[in-house]
Amino acid sequence: SERCDDWGLDTMRQIQVFEDEPARIKCPLFEHFLKFNYSTAHSAGLTLIWYWTRQDRDLEEPINFRLPENRISKEKDVLWFRPTLLNDTGNYTCMLRNTTYCSKVAFPLEVVQKDSCFNSPMKLPVHKLYIEYGIQRITCPNVDGYFPSSVKPTITWYMGCYKIQNFNNVIPEGMNLSFLIALISNNGNYTCVVTYPENGRTFHLTRTLTVKVVGSPKNAVPPVIHSPNDHVVYEKEPGEELLIPCTVYFSFLMDSRNEVWWTIDGKKPDDITIDVTINESISHSRTEDETRTQILSIKKVTSEDLKRSYVCHARSAKGEVAKAAKVKQKVPAPRYTVELACGFGAT
C-alpha cells in the first residue's frame, strides 16, 4: 500500500473503560493531530477506517462490526462499544484515507474490572474543592453523547462504598453532587452511576473521581519565609561549614508555580565561582499548602564568603518575598598566654 502519515501509538491518551459498560471513543486524529474535523474530511471524500491489535499480539486485524446486537459500531468519528468486554483491551487504530491521502494514529484501550465498591486499576481524575468556601459542585464526568437529551437517566452517587443519602453536607442533585461546605472529612472517592435505557436494554455508566479538599483562595497569602529570620545569626570561622536553610510556606493556590531560590551577592549560585550546593525538600499539609526548604551549603567557608549577602527568595502567584540571612565571621577567642597576659601587664 502507498505511504501513510503514521502518528504512531498515542500513549498520552491511555483510554480506560469499565467492563460491561458502554464506551464511546473518538478518533484522536481530529482532536489532536489534524487541523480539520470529521465533517470536513467526510465531505472531501475521505473514509475513516478502524482496526485493532489485541493485547499481547502483533497482528493488526479489522474490527468486527457484525457482532450480535451491534456490540461494536462506528458512528462518524466515534467507535462505540455497547457494552465492552474484557478482551476488547488492545491498541486501536483509526485511519483516514482516500486514493491520494492517508493519516493514521493508534491508541491503547484498556477494559478494566471493578469490584462492588468501585475499586479498580482505573486512574482517577482529581477534583479539588476549597475548604470552607461555600457551596461547590462536582459533575459526573464523561457522560455526554451516550444518550439523547430526551432520555432521563437515573443517577446514584456513592462515597466509597456508601450510597450518598442523608449526608450532612453532601447533596446529590442529578448529575451534580453539591458540597455545602467542604471539609477535610469530604476527601475521598466519589462515584456516580448513570443508568439509562436504549433499544430495550439498560446500560450503566460508572464514573469515579477523587475529591481533594484544598486551601481556600480566601485564605491564600504571599509566601512566608520562616528561615532565614531575624533571630538566627550564622556566625562561622573560616574553614567551617556554612549551612543556611531557606524555609518557605506557600498557601495552596490553584495552578500557581511555587519557586524558591538563593542569591549570593545578587547572583544565582550557579553563576558564581564558590563551591556551593543547594538541597531541596518539599512537604505538604492536608490542604496542599506547601513548605519548601532549600539548604545552602558551603563546605569550607572563607573569610570572603562570610562577607557576602545570602538572600532567600520565594515567589508564588500571590507575590514575591525575600529575606537576607545574618552571616558574620566569628571573632576568634583571645589566646590566653599572649593577649590576656599582655592585658594583665605581663612583659
Epitope: V221, P222, P223, V224, I225, D230, V233, T263, D265, G266, R308, S309, Y310, V311, K318, G319, E320, V321, A322, K323, A324, A325, K326, V327, K328
Partner: antibody
Framework: SVEESGGRLVTPGTPLTLTCTVS????????MGWVRQAPGKGLEWIGI?????SIYYASWAKGRFTISKTSTTVDLKMTSLTTEDTATYFC??????????????WGQGTLVTVSS | DIVMTQTPSPVSGAVGGTVTIKCQAS??????LAWYQQKPGQPPKLLIY???TLESGVPSRFKGSRSGTDYTLTISDLESADAATYYC????????????FGGGTEVVVK
C-alpha cells in the same frame, strides 16, 4: 503606579490624612512604605505596611502616625502636627510582599506645610 | 535605634573618575542595606539592595560592598548624570525603626 495626595497647608495641632493610591498592582502582593523629606533635608523613614497587614513604624512616629490600607489605597493618618512635620511625604512600593528591603517604585510626593 | 552615619559630604570627582561613599551602621545589620540616588525635585531611585545587588536598569558602574558594619558605594566611570545626593538605608526589617536612612552624601561631578 503610586500617587500621593492630601498634602496641604495646615495649622499646628491639626490632624491630616495622606492617601497613596495605587494602580496596576494589588496591595495583597506588595509591602508599602512612607518616607518624608523636610525642605533641604534628608530622607526620614516613617513606616511600612506589608501585604499580610503587619505595620511597623519608626520609633519617633509611633503613636502620632497611623498607617492603614484598603484594596487600592494606603493611608497615613497624622495627628498633633507641628512645624517640624513640614515635609514632602513619599509613598513607595517594595518589590516584595514581606518587607521594605527593595523600595523600587516611588510616587512624586505630596507637600505638607504646617504653619501658624 | 540603629543610626546610619554617612561620610563625607559633599564628595567630588571628575567625569570618568571614581567616587566612594561610606556608610557606617551603629550595630551589625549584616546584608540589610540599600542605596538610593536622589536628584532635586525627584523622588529617590533605588540603586542597590542587600548590600551589592543591583536594581534592574542600574548600570554596573555602581557597586556596593560591606566590611563589618562599614558599607561602601563606589561609582566608577563617573558621568555628569551621576551628580545627585546618595542615601544609604538600613533594611534590618525586624521593626519599623530599623529602616533608618543615612544623612545623605552629595556627589559633585566636575
Amino acid at each position: 503606579s503610586v500617587e500621593e495626595s492630601g498634602g496641604r497647608l495646615v495649622t499646628p495641632g491639626t490632624p491630616l490624612t495622606l492617601t497613596c493610591t495605587v494602580s496596576g498592582f494589588s496591595l495583597d502582593s506588595y509591602a508599602m512604605g512612607w518616607v518624608r523629606q523636610a525642605p533641604g533635608k534628608g530622607l526620614e523613614w516613617i513606616g511600612i505596611i506589608n501585604s499580610y497587614g503587619s505595620i511597623y513604624y519608626a520609633s519617633w512616629a509611633k503613636g502620632r502616625f497611623t498607617i492603614s490600607k484598603t484594596s487600592t489605597t494606603v493611608d497615613l493618618k497624622m495627628t498633633s502636627l507641628t512645624t517640624e512635620d513640614t515635609a514632602t511625604y513619599f509613598c513607595a512600593r517594595s518589590a516584595y510582599s514581606n518587607n521594605g528591603d527593595r523600595l523600587h517604585l516611588w510616587g512624586q510626593g505630596t507637600l505638607v506645610t504646617v504653619s501658624s | 535605634d540603629i543610626v546610619m552615619t554617612q561620610t563625607p559630604s559633599p564628595v567630588s570627582g571628575a567625569v570618568g573618575g571614581t567616587v566612594t561613599i561610606k556608610c557606617q551602621a551603629s550595630e551589625d545589620i549584616y546584608s540589610n542595606l540599600a542605596w538610593y540616588q536622589q536628584k532635586p525635585g525627584q523622588p529617590p531611585k533605588l540603586l542597590i539592595y542587600y548590600v551589592s545587588t543591583l536594581e534592574s536598569g542600574v548600570p554596573s558602574r555602581f557597586k556596593g560592598s560591606r566590611s563589618g558594619t562599614d558599607y561602601t558605594l563606589t561609582i566608577s566611570d563617573l558621568e555628569s548624570a551621576d551628580a545627585a545626593t546618595y542615601y544609604c538605608q538600613c533594611t534590618e526589617g525586624g521593626s519599623g525603626s530599623d529602616y533608618t536612612f543615612g544623612g545623605g552624601t552629595e556627589v559633585v561631578v566636575k
